[in-house]
């Protein structure tokens, strides 16, 4: 079998909301993946599991099941959303993200994603990790491909 390539493109959108009383930040982060099937037969993208970390703490998880089938020598772009919560022992971040003296509130998040594909009963997992800047003070949307230059570090191979 030939390879199945997973490329993390970047953040497609980050929508922020706050609970003022609980000093909690809610960030809905939509990411984009390109999955390329280099085989001459179809493969099924069985599931995508993702998590987001801030300062080594997991702040959000998501899982998508039975996603799509990718035809021979084809590529599909898949968006997945991870709801994240920055709260409790990290509530000090609320002060930073809502600081009224500055307009830009960048934080660095680690995006982790694992794609499970199956073909002819065989299962394969491909993982990616990528650090991304997100502005926790405002909503942000990106044009396609605009955010693939946001990498703080290269993905682990």
């Amino acid at each position: 079998p030939r390879s199945i390539d997973v490329k993390y493109i970047g953040v497609k959108s980050a929508y922020v909301s706050y609970d003022v009383q609980k000093r909690t930040i809610y960030l809905n982060i939509t990411n984009t993946l390109n999955i390329t099937n280099n085989n001459y037969y179809s493969v099924e993208v069985e599931n995508i599991t993702a998590q987001v970390q801030f300062s080594k703490t997991v702040i959000g998880k998501a899982r998508l099941n039975n996603i799509t089938i990718i035809g021979p020598l084809d590529m599909k772009q898949i968006d997945y959303t991870v709801p994240t919560v920055i709260a409790e022992e990290m509530s000090y971040m609320y002060d930073f993200c809502t600081l009224i003296s500055i307009k830009v509130h960048n934080i660095v998040l680690m995006m982790q994603v694992t794609v499970t594909t199956t073909y002819f009963g065989h299962s394969e997992q491909i993982s990616q990790e990528r650090y991304q800047y997100v502005d926790c003070g405002r909503n942000t949307t990106y044009q396609l491909g605009q955010s693939e230059y946001l990498n703080v570090l290269q993905p682990q191979q």
Epitope: Y18, C97, K103, N106, Y133, D135, G137, Q146
Partner: antibody, heavy 118, light 113 residues
Framework: EVQLQQSGPVLVKPGPSVKISCMAS????????IHWVKQSHGKSLEWIGL????????NYNQNFKGKATLTVDTSSRTAYMELNSLTSEDSAVYYC???????????WGQGTLVTVSE | DIVMTQSPSSLSVSVGEKVTVSCKSS????????????LAWYQQKPGQPPKLLIY???TRESGVPDRFTGSGSGTDFTLTISSVQAEDLAVYYC?????????FGAGTKLELK
């Protein structure tokens, strides 16, 4: 519909101060920054500053420090701007507007015309 | 403070025409972290408050017709109206949304030829 209802036009003499108001309805007052913007007749827009109703925190344009004072009364869901030492240069339409925290200013009041004249 | 310079100051147009308004900032409006440009465009009709059209240099506000397009990066930005309608006759302002104090361009007045 979201509303920022501003007080009516005022005609004042040079010297003293004037206080104009901006009453919020239909949205959670404490969840937004309230901005104040000046527009002199036929001119562009000048950002005066903002106030955060939740804690009364303010951020002023240095050009308006000492000229404008921004306050809020959360019980009446009203933001106020007081302008002091009035001169003809202060004659303008003053807008209050809101932004969801650091998002762009997305909604504006109808404006209050302040005329400073003998 | 960031100075916003708009050109032209006024434009005479016919309905259906394509229009471009330029805006230059004295400092970059790029958030070097997330690579997003923090520039907004507003439309103001006579006797009305400004209305947000575009934010993040290129993202249309909800309900804004797709004939309005924002582009540009760093210090050079453009608002394009692909086919001007009579209701588009107004003054257009660009605004620095990157740092305080928020600053606006002098405006571009769109008039009917």
């Amino acid at each position: 519909e979201v509303q920022l209802q501003q007080s009516g036009p005022v005609l004042v003499k040079p010297g003293p101060s004037v206080k104009i108001s901006c009453m919020a309805s239909v949205f959670t007052f404490n969840d937004y920054y309230i901005h104040w913007v000046k527009q002199s007749h036929g001119k562009s827009l000048e950002w005066i500053g903002l106030v955060y109703p939740y804690n009364g925190g303010t951020n002023y344009n240095q050009n308006f420090k000492g000229k404008a004072t921004l306050t809020v009364d959360t019980s009446s869901r009203t933001a106020y701007m007081e302008l002091n030492s009035l001169t003809s240069e202060d004659s303008a339409v003053y807008y209050c507007a809101r932004s969801y925290f650091s998002n762009p200013i997305g909604y504006w009041g109808q404006g209050t015309l302040v005329t400073v004249s003998e | 403070d960031i100075v916003m310079t708009q050109s032209p100051s006024s434009l005479s147009v016919s309905v259906g025409e394509k229009v471009t308004v330029s805006c230059k900032s004295s400092q970059s409006l790029l958030n070097s972290g997330n690579q997003k440009n923090y520039l907004a465009w507003y439309q103001q009709k006579p006797g009305q408050p400004p209305k947000l059209l575009i934010y993040g240099a290129s993202t249309r506000e909800s309900g804004v017709p797709d004939r309005f397009t924002g582009s540009g990066s760093g210090t050079d930005f453009t608002l394009t109206i692909s086919s001007v309608q009579a209701e588009d006759l107004a003054v257009y302002y660009c605004q620095n949304d990157h740092s305080y104090p928020l600053t606006f361009g002098a405006g571009t007045k769109l008039e009917l030829k």
